[in-house]
Interface confidence: medium
C-alpha cells in the first residue's frame, strides 16, 4: 500500500452535469459524501465502489472496507467495525460473539488442537492484526464494558484492542 490515501482530497469538486451511474453511484454538485462501501474520487467527480480498488495502491481510501473484505476471507476471523480491526476468533473463544460461534464451537470440541493464539489468549493476550502501515492507536475499553459491536464480549484492561489510526 502506498500510504498516500485519497480520502484527504475533499476539495471543491464540481460535477457540472448529471450522468448515468448505475448501481447507486451518485452525481450532483459537490457531492462528497458517499454511500457505505463507496468513496468519493475527486478526479472522477463521483462516488466509486471500494471493491474496485482493494487491490490497488490507493487502498487506504477504503482501508476499513478493504481490510474487512480481506478479513472475511480468512477462516476463523471476522472484522469488527467498531474496533476497526480483524479479530481472530481463536483469541476470544469462550467469550466470543456470534460471528465466531462456528469457529469457536468446533475448536472447543477438540481442545487438544488449541491453536497458539488461543493458548496466548488464556494467558491474557489478544492477537492483533495490522495493515501494512504499522501505525496504531490504543483504544481503551473502560474496565470490562461490553463492546456494542461485540455482543457479550468483554475486554479486560489486559486485553486492550489496537485499532488502525
Amino acid at each position: 500500500m502506498s500510504g498516500l490515501g485519497r480520502s484527504r482530497r475533499g476539495g471543491r469538486s464540481r460535477v457540472d452535469q448529471e450522468e448515468r451511474f448505475p448501481q447507486g453511484l451518485w452525481t450532483g454538485v459537490a457531492m462528497r459524501s458517499c454511500p457505505e462501501e463507496q468513496y468519493w474520487d475527486p478526479l472522477l467527480g463521483t462516488c466509486m465502489s471500494c471493491k474496485t480498488i482493494c487491490n490497488h495502491q490507493s487502498q487506504r481510501t477504503c482501508a476499513a472496507f478493504c481490510r474487512s473484505l480481506s478479513c472475511r476471507k480468512e477462516q476463523g476471523k471476522f472484522y469488527d467495525h467498531l474496533l476497526r480491526d480483524c479479530i481472530s476468533c481463536a483469541s476470544i473463544c469462550g467469550q466470543h460473539p456470534k460471528q465466531c460461534a462456528y469457529f469457536c464451537e468446533n475448536k472447543l470440541r477438540s481442545p487438544v488442537n488449541l491453536p497458539p493464539e488461543l493458548r496466548r489468549q488464556r494467558s491474557g493476550e489478544v492477537e492483533n492484526n495490522s495493515d501494512n502501515s504499522g501505525r496504531y492507536q490504543g483504544l481503551e475499553h473502560r474496565g470490562s464494558e461490553a463492546s456494542p459491536a461485540l455482543p457479550g464480549l468483554k475486554l479486560s484492561a489486559d486485553q486492550v484492542a489496537l485499532v488502525y489510526s
Epitope: 482530497r9 471543491r12 460535477v15 478526479l43 472522477l44 490497488h56
Partner: antibody, heavy 118, light 107 residues
Framework: QVQLVQSGAEVKKPGASVKVSCKAS????????MHWVKQKPGQGLEWMGY????????KYAQKFQGKVTMTSDKSTSTVYMELSSLTSEDTAVYYC???????????WGQGTLVTVSS | DIQMTQSPSSLSASVGDRVTITCRAS??????LSWYQQKPGKAPKLLMR???RLHSGVPSRFSGSGSGTDFTLTISSLEQEDFATYYC?????????FGGGTKVEIK
C-alpha cells in the same frame, strides 16, 4: 504486461460519425476506469471523458457533451469512443488512457488519428 | 476547471545539461501532479505520479518536486532520448487538466 491497442486511422466526411476502439489486456478490465484524451495536430492534450467498464457509467467534459459517446464491451475488454456530427475541429489523434486510481493515467493506447475532410 | 500553466513552452539544451520545467496550478492540487513525456507520433508516457514518484521503468535522472500550486520536473543530465515534449497534469479535482506542454529541443 498492460497493453491498450487502438483501432486504425480513419478518414471521415463532415457530418459523419466515427467509432474508435481501445482493446485492453494484461489486467482486470473492469477494475480500472478508461479515459479518452484528444490531441489536435501540433497541440496539447485535452481530456474528453471516461467510462467505468464495470457498470458502464460515463462522465464527459462539458465541451464534449453531445459530441462523444463512450461504451464498453466486457466480453472483449474493449472500450469505444464514438464522435458524432464530425467537423474539421474533430481532426485529431484520440488516445485511450487507463486511470491508476491516484490521479494519473498510467498506460496509454498508441492513438488513433481521425481526419475529417470533405 | 483548474488551469495548468507550464513554463517555458520550449527550451534548447545539450546532452548532459540539467533541465528544469515548471508547472503552476491555478489552485491548490496537493501533490496530485503527474508528468508525461511525448515524442512525435507517439502516445504520452507517464514519467512521474504524485509529484515525485517515478513510474516503473523511468530512469532516476528524472525527479519531481513541489506541492500545492508550484511544481518542478528536473532532468539531472539530459540524454539523447529525453528530447521530447513534457506535459504536467493535475489529478486532484474533476475534471483532469493538462499543462500546455514544454518542448525540449537539441541546442
Amino acid at each position: 504486461q498492460v497493453q491498450l491497442v487502438q483501432s486504425g486511422a480513419e478518414v471521415k466526411k463532415p457530418g459523419a460519425s466515427v467509432k474508435v476502439s481501445c482493446k485492453a489486456s494484461g489486467y482486470t478490465f473492469t477494475n480500472y476506469v478508461m479515459h479518452w484524451v484528444k490531441q489536435k495536430p501540433g497541440q496539447g492534450l485535452e481530456w474528453m471523458g471516461y467510462i467505468l467498464p464495470y457498470n458502464d457509467g460515463t462522465k464527459y467534459a462539458q465541451k464534449f457533451q453531445g459530441k462523444v459517446t463512450m461504451t464498453s464491451d466486457k466480453s472483449t475488454s474493449t472500450v469505444y469512443m464514438e464522435l458524432s456530427s464530425l467537423t474539421s475541429e474533430d481532426t485529431a489523434v484520440y488516445y485511450c488512457a487507463r486511470y491508476d486510481w491516484e490521479g494519473s493515467f498510467d498506460y496509454w493506447g498508441q492513438g488513433t488519428l481521425v481526419t475529417v475532410s470533405s | 476547471d483548474i488551469q495548468m500553466t507550464q513554463s517555458p513552452s520550449s527550451l534548447s539544451a545539450s546532452v548532459g545539461d540539467r533541465v528544469t520545467i515548471t508547472c503552476r496550478a491555478s489552485q491548490d492540487i496537493s501533490n496530485y501532479l503527474s508528468w508525461y513525456q511525448q515524442k512525435p507520433g507517439k502516445a504520452p508516457k507517464l514519467l512521474m505520479r504524485y509529484t515525485s514518484r517515478l513510474h516503473s521503468g523511468v530512469p532516476s535522472r528524472f525527479s519531481g518536486s513541489g506541492s500545492g500550486t508550484d511544481f518542478t520536473l528536473t532532468i539531472s543530465s539530459l540524454e539523447q532520448e529525453d528530447f521530447a515534449t513534457y506535459y504536467c497534469q493535475q489529478g486532484n479535482l474533476f475534471p483532469p487538466t493538462f499543462g500546455g506542454g514544454t518542448k525540449v529541443e537539441i541546442k
